[in-house]
């Protein structure tokens, strides 16, 4: 039994199977990429501000630390892939979508053509896809996390798409629109079956999903409120209506975290009541996007997690299953699930 020899090299749990040993972790710990070492996962607030991306530990009350990234000019939307320890961001000056490790190393552009104002972006951590909204081209697009196999998903009847949120377990994408009739919309993650959820709303920003309680949260830039609804846009609740200028928003555990452009701050409150407010950080410049980097924000299962759903290029989650997709101008062969060039 290899586990008998120095615990199989595992820091905590060692599982012996007929083919190999496998390390595991007790509940609450995480396995590092070496597949042997368990660590206590740390939760970070990560946010974009001008030419920098910053992080703040939520557990050790560390001060605001700029991630040492090169080549950032005007960072806008932000997301992460916890399994690869990557952060992704859009830059409206460079007109690119980039990624790097959380320590700032290995910066690379994953999308660098055909972008105008990419102000919304979300990582599909199950299908390993990147979704983004462009208020200039009026499109929502998808590609693999490395930028390959890019496809336009939604382009009809879009009016300034802004903030994106994904629920890959259920197969839905949510977004906000800031056009003449602002609204919150839901579709399948393949871009089909678009449906307006909320139309009596101002410019909704930083749409956020509470996966545990199945609630949507957003800031309304026209009313300066933080609101919440169920996943169908119903059961709307005002979480806060006395804030000067809330902008960015994220949720983690029992709390929501938001940025305020008048107070130049990041604050926290109970996610259901908006009470017990705490100042997390003050004296901040205009924060464009904010999120919590933690594995609990990227949990769950779907078809695309196993062998890319047998798809040759894109595996796009839909309710109850998935659909294979191809890069623009490529054609899907339904039987082989591969894509043919034009």
């Amino acid at each position: 039994n290899p586990c008998a020899d120095r615990n199989g090299g595992c820091s905590h749990l060692c599982f012996f199977t007929p083919h190999a040993t496998r390390c595991g972790c007790p509940i609450g710990l995480e396995l590092l990429s070496d597949m042997k070492t368990c660590i206590v996962p740390e939760a970070f607030l990560v946010f974009t501000s001008r030419a920098a991306i910053h992080r703040i530990s939520l557990e050790t009350n560390n001060n605001d630390v700029a991630i040492p990234l090169t080549g950032v000019k005007e960072a806008s939307a932000l997301d992460f892939d916890v399994s690869n320890n990557h952060i992704y961001w859009t830059d409206v000056s460079l007109k690119t979508i980039s990624r790097a490790f959380m320590n700032g190393s290995s910066v690379e552009h994953v999308v660098e053509f055909g972008l105008d104002y990419p102000e919304g972006m979300a990582v599909d951590w199950m299908g390993k896809n990147l979704y983004w909204a462009d208020t200039g081209t009026n499109r929502i697009e998808v590609a693999r996390l490395d930028g390959q196999f890019r496809q336009v998903l939604v382009w009809r009847d879009l009016d300034n798409p802004r903030s994106l949120a994904l629920d890959p377990t259920k197969g839905y994408i949510y977004w906000t629109e800031w056009g003449g009739k602002p609204r919150i919309v839901r579709a399948f993650m393949d871009g089909t079956n678009c449906m307006t959820l909320v139309d009596k709303v101002g410019r909704a920003n930083d749409l956020t999903i509470d996966y545990a309680d199945q609630r949507l949260y957003w800031t309304d830039l026209d009313t300066n409120m933080i609101e919440s609804s169920n996943m169908l846009g119903q059961e709307r609740v005002v979480i806060a209506d006395d804030l000067p200028h809330p902008f960015g928003l994220t949720q983690y555990s029992d709390y929501i975290y938001w940025t305020d452009w008048n107070l130049h701050s990041i604050e926290r409150a109970d996610k259901t009541s908006g009470r017990n407010r705490t100042l997390i950080q003050g004296h901040l410049d205009f924060v464009m996007d904010i999120l919590v980097f933690h594995s609990s924000r990227q949990d769950g299962l779907n078809d695309c997690m196993h062998n890319n759903g047998q798809c040759g290029q894109l595996c796009l989650a839909i309710p109850g299953g998935h659909r294979c997709g191809c890069a623009s101008h490529y054609t899907l062969d339904p039987s082989s699930r591969n894509c043919s060039p034009p």
Partner: nanobody, 126 residues
């Protein structure tokens, strides 16, 4: 506090060009995004163009895209609006404005600007 003074307006024939300038006083000019708005008689003030704090991103109204170009020189505390292929419907008072929001499509909205100039009149007529 930022003070803004526009110049360069005047009478021009259709198809002609003008270059508007906006000089800003104050040491914090480079931390502000700058925008141009216009107001024709009897109409609402409307967005024309904006440029981010660094000059890295620019934003235009559909009606002027391809004809107008916004730029800035942070060393001179000045923002410019180069207007080509002018049309009679471009006739308006043009206002320069400063926004503390550094960049993004929010710069298209006038209520996101804190400081305004007095305006300069542009008349396009034959």
């Amino acid at each position: 506090e930022v003070q803004l003074v526009e110049s360069g307006g005047g009478l021009v024939q259709p198809g002609g060009s003008l270059r508007l300038s906006c000089a800003a006083s104050g040491r914090t000019f480079s931390s502000y995004a700058m925008g141009w708005f216009r107001q024709a008689p009897g109409k609402e003030r409307e967005f024309v163009a904006a440029i981010s704090w660094s000059g890295g991103s620019t934003y235009y109204a559909d009606s002027v895209k391809g004809r107008f170009t916004i730029s800035r020189d942070n060393s001179k505390n000045t923002v410019y609006l180069q207007m080509n292929s002018l049309r009679p419907e471009d006739t308006a008072v043009y206002y320069c404005a400063a926004s503390p929001i550094p960049y993004g499509s929010l710069l298209r909205r006038r209520n996101n600007y804190d400081y305004w100039g007095q305006g300069t009149l542009v008349t396009v007529s034959s």
